[in-house]
């Protein structure tokens, strides 16, 4: 009975879901081979992207794993998780606190002019306080980070600061005092709702935003330090100390960097030492005539950082200014998070042990990791395969890839180090979730940073994640040459074990190879093979270039070509090497599947898939994103891949079937 | 708890010059705002000026160029003085501290009569 | 300045009914968003004792039969039910900008 030869439809739940939310993203009566994009993600434009989507997704389940009453070990980390969370929720007790808890800290900082107690007490004890207990840095960041010379020694790393005001260097001046005067408005709320009268709370706020203002003149941009060799300046606390007298160096970053043991003669990586001599001078001149009005400055910005923990008026006066701000830098207005999305993030951010291993054990279990494993493999050999017929890629250069890609590490789900049963059922000995839920918030911030610290001072055999195992990115570290792909992103719509394979080949499997891509990106930059044969990379280079330059935008997205080459690299190589993957895969291997009444072959299914992983609106940061906007991350990959003309039937010449291609990958 | 207790000299004679004091405890003068206000017999109260924990000061403006509030902060005493007196300040002089929110604390006051 | 008018001069409520007194500001006492009220009961010969501060918030200690509301320029202090004790003089207060100034007040009588 030749009628049973075809792939079988699969009707299990998993698929039946996946093929309702094709059905209700994509718009079919769009023709294919002119806009793939629409027919893909027609219906979905007006969406968040698919990956904020399922970023979402996650942190739901994270919610229900939050809010199903458990019966926890007493004093463990997941009833610390537990209570966090519900303590966040419990929006009635907040409220009914209101700005008492805040006071007291205020107090404890030696108060301020506005209200409450004034004890004028030492600048440096508040600034020592400020940062190593409630991890907040008026005048400077500091922060461990890898040594420049050797990534993988930690070294104290002193940076500017970041303005909780969205200033840009290359800002008109115009909307440079229009966003000073909505942030004034805003201090101004924070001092009433302290209690402050408005005389002494606007005369505060303003010297407040002078003093900001003054810092941000003080910033040398990134591009400069670079070019003049200042971006990583070797140290010591003595010399900072000469550079910078108004700060006390040493006790101050001893007591942040708590229990690391420092002296006069330690070294530091300084990213910015004009700017620190800068403000060390701001910083005395106000010491000397208005030191008043420098313990507000501190404590406002201490007061704008906690406001997430605090009464819902701070939270309307933080919501409307962040609306000005938004409407000021022509950003569109941000979507209201509900209460239980910021809880979730705090409780992930400070008890993400715990977290990681709930979340692993609920959504990414032994079987779909072995299986993510198994298609990580197939696109891992499908490069190696690849990279033997790249014609601008000499043998030297080819054996130098492919032991790159035989030494990479790749960490799926979670790191191992993350699910290690004594650090997921850690105790947290040191939170105390106290009297009031800022209280709450600022032992666990304790906790964390001491954790931190810890954790860069253990010798570290294993790669230091940069994401949540429930977070949506997967990176490659240069440093640790390891691709990380979190648990979050390896779930539906983008991938399950029980999915047609076209599915997770075509969704998971093209992203997997966009990452390991990018492990030569140093490559494609000029200069960057002296090996390889550089006209014929030049000649792949321009044409991908003109390829993208060809297609038509939709009406006001703007994007930075020059920005987003890699990327596009990525895109376009990562198809042909997930789909290169595929083929393999179907000549090996019978029984694939596809999804019911949709009417597409399991090739157009993987194709199909790809475009579904970029689904998203189209937004103004498009020009600043080293990402094509989401019509060209669709048509740019699939314009190049003749697979797709051939099993979507294109007419030559089509937009999507193109006379000429390019191949760089 | 907090207290303010204001003395003043009963009774002047026009042209004269009005002092009174206002002895605090219960808070620092370094961190709080005293104010003055007055209630002429029988009739509403007066704001007059206020003393903010830095020394700055704000007054009525139809008595700025008579009026000077000053403080000790060691002694925990503001001081009011109030020059050229004419019979309608005639009036029963408070002193109260400005408590974060506005909340506000009051001495019980002292009558000063100024009659020929 | 900021001229306060009540409303009522004098108004005499039976016991256990309720007492609404008006102050109109001739310009808004608000300050970002919080307006800044305040209300003041004073018997005779005594100090004024503060009952309501920044519009709606309790003093300490004072009885929840008294409510303040309003925004801007429009404010009502609301005692129900009244009682015997409340028979005084009521003044609001604005702090928004100086120099501070009071209504004319509002004799309340308990019939």
């Known amino acids: 009975n030749f009628q049973n030869c075809g792939p079988r439809p699969c009707e299990t739940s998993v698929c039946l879901d996946l093929r309702d939310h094709y059905l209700a993203s994509g718009n079919t009566s769009v023709a294919p081979c002119t806009d793939f994009f629409s027919f893909a993600c027609g219906r979905a434009k007006e969406t968040n992207n698919s990956f904020q989507e399922l970023a979402t997704k996650n942190k739901n389940r994270l919610r229900r794993i939050l809010e199903v009453q458990n019966s926890w070990h007493p004093g463990s980390g997941e009833e610390k998780a537990f209570q966090f969370y519900n303590s966040c929720m419990d929006t009635l007790a907040i409220e009914a606190a209101g700005t008492g808890p805040l006071r007291q800290v205020i107090e404890e900082l030696g108060g301020w002019r506005i209200s409450g107690k004034w004890t004028s007490l030492n600048f440096n004890r508040t600034l020592r306080l400020l940062m190593s207990q409630y991890g907040h840095f008026p005048f400077f960041r500091a922060y461990l980070g890898p040594h420049p010379a050797s990534p993988h020694t930690p070294v104290i790393q002193i940076d500017q600061p970041e303005f909780d005001v969205p200033l840009k260097q290359d800002q008109e001046q115009k909307i440079y005092a229009q966003i000073f005067r909505e942030y004034l408005t805003y201090l101004n709320q924070l001092g009433t709702l302290l209690g402050g009268d408005p005389s002494k709370v606007q005369e505060h706020s303003s010297l407040s935003i002078s003093i900001t203002s003054r810092l941000f003149q003080f910033l040398r941009p990134l591009e400069q330090r670079r070019a003049q060799g200042k971006l990583f300046q070797m140290v010591t606390i003595d010399q900072l100390k000469e550079m910078a007298p108004a700060i006390d160096w040493l006790s101050c970053l001893q007591a942040t960097f708590t229990p690391m043991s420092l002296s006069p003669s330690q070294s530091l990586v300084v990213h910015d030492v004009e700017y620190l001599k800068n403000m060390s001078q701001l910083v005395e001149e106000m010491l000397l005539k208005q030191r008043d009005f420098l313990q507000s400055h501190m404590i406002l910005g201490l007061v704008v950082t906690l406001s997430p923990a605090l009464d819902s008026q701070f939270q309307e006066a933080r919501r409307k200014l962040s609306q000005k701000l938004r409407e000021l830098t022509e950003q569109p207005p941000m979507p209201a998070r509900p209460r239980w999305m910021k809880c979730v993030e705090e409780t992930g951010t400070f008890f993400e042990p715990t977290l990681a291993a709930l979340f692993v054990r609920e959504a990414f279990g032994p079987s779909t990791r072995s299986a993510a494993m198994k298609l990580f493999t197939a696109i891992r050999d499908a490069l190696i395969t690849r990279l033997r017929n790249l014609p601008w890629m000499n043998e030297e250069t080819q054996n130098m890839a492919q032991d790159k890609v035989a030494q990479l590490q790749v960490e799926m789900g979670a790191s191992e180090w993350a699910l290690k049963p004594e650090l997921a059922r850690q105790e947290y000995n040191d939170i105390q979730l106290g009297s009031s839920f800022l209280q709450s918030v600022l032992s666990c911030v304790r906790s964390l940073r001491a954790r931190i610290v810890q954790s860069f001072l253990q010798p570290h055999p294993q790669h230091r994640w940069k994401v949540s195992p429930w977070d949506v990115n997967a990176y490659y570290s240069v440093s640790d040459h390891v691709v990380v792909f979190p648990a979050g992103l390896l779930q539906p719509p983008f991938f399950h074990p029980g999915y047609p394979r076209a599915v997770n080949f075509g969704a998971a499997g093209s992203i997997m190879a966009h990452e390991l891509l990018h492990i030569f990106y140093q490559l494609l930059l000029p200069g960057g093979c002296l090996a390889c044969d550089n006209h014929a990379l030049q000649e792949a280079h321009l044409c991908l270039k003109r390829h993208y330059a060809a297609f038509p935008l939709p009406s006001r997205t703007s994007f930075n070509d020059s920005l987003t080459f890699l990327e596009n690299a990525a895109d376009v190589g990562g198809l042909a090497i997930a789909l290169q993957a595929y083929s393999k895969r179907l000549l090996r291997h019978h029984g694939e599947t596809v999804l019911p009444s949709l009417d597409l072959s399991p090739q157009q299914i993987f194709f199909r898939s790809y475009a579904q992983v970029m689904c998203r609106k189209p937004s103004p940061q498009d020009s600043h994103d080293t990402h094509s906007p989401p019509h060209l991350r669709v048509h740019g990959p699939l314009s190049s891949t003749p697979a797709f003309a051939r099993y979507f039937r294109c007419a030559r010449g089509a937009l999507l079937n193109p006379s000429s291609r390019c191949q760089l990958w | 708890q907090v207290q303010l207790k204001e003395s003043g000299p009963g009774l002047l004679a026009p042209s004269q010059s009005l002092s009174i004091t206002c002895t605090v405890s219960?808070?620092?003068?370094?961190?709080?705002?005293v104010y003055w206000v007055r209630q002429p017999p029988g009739k509403g109260l007066e704001w007059l000026g206020i003393i903010w924990g830095d020394g700055s000061t704000n007054y009525q403006s139809v008595l700025r160029s008579r009026l000077s509030i000053t403080k000790d902060d060691s002694k925990s005493q503001v001081f009011l003085k109030l020059n050229s007196l004419q019979t309608d300040d005639t009036a029963t002089y408070y002193c109260?501290?400005?408590?974060?929110?506005?909340?506000?604390?009051w001495g019980q006051g002292t009558l000063v009569t100024v009659s020929a | 300045d900021i001229v306060l008018t009540q409303s009522p001069a004098s108004l005499a409520v039976s016991l256990g009914q309720r007492a609404i007194i008006s102050c109109k500001a001739s310009?808004?006492?608000?300050?970002?968003?919080?307006?800044?009220m305040h209300w003041y009961q004073q018997r005779p010969g005594q100090q004024p004792k503060l009952l309501i501060y920044r519009t709606s918030n309790l003093e300490a200690g004072v009885p929840t039969r008294f409510s303040g509301s309003g925004s801007r320029t429009d404010f009502t202090l609301n005692i129900h039910p009244v009682e015997e004790d409340d028979a005084a003089t009521y003044y609001c207060q604005q702090s928004r900008e100086f120099p501070w100034t009071f209504g004319g007040g509002t004799r309340l009588e308990i019939k």
């Open positions: 219960g808070f620092s003068l370094t961190s709080y705002g």
């Open positions: 109260a501290k400005r408590g974060d929110y506005d909340v506000a604390y």
């Open positions: 310009q808004t006492v608000s300050f970002v968003g919080t307006s800044l």
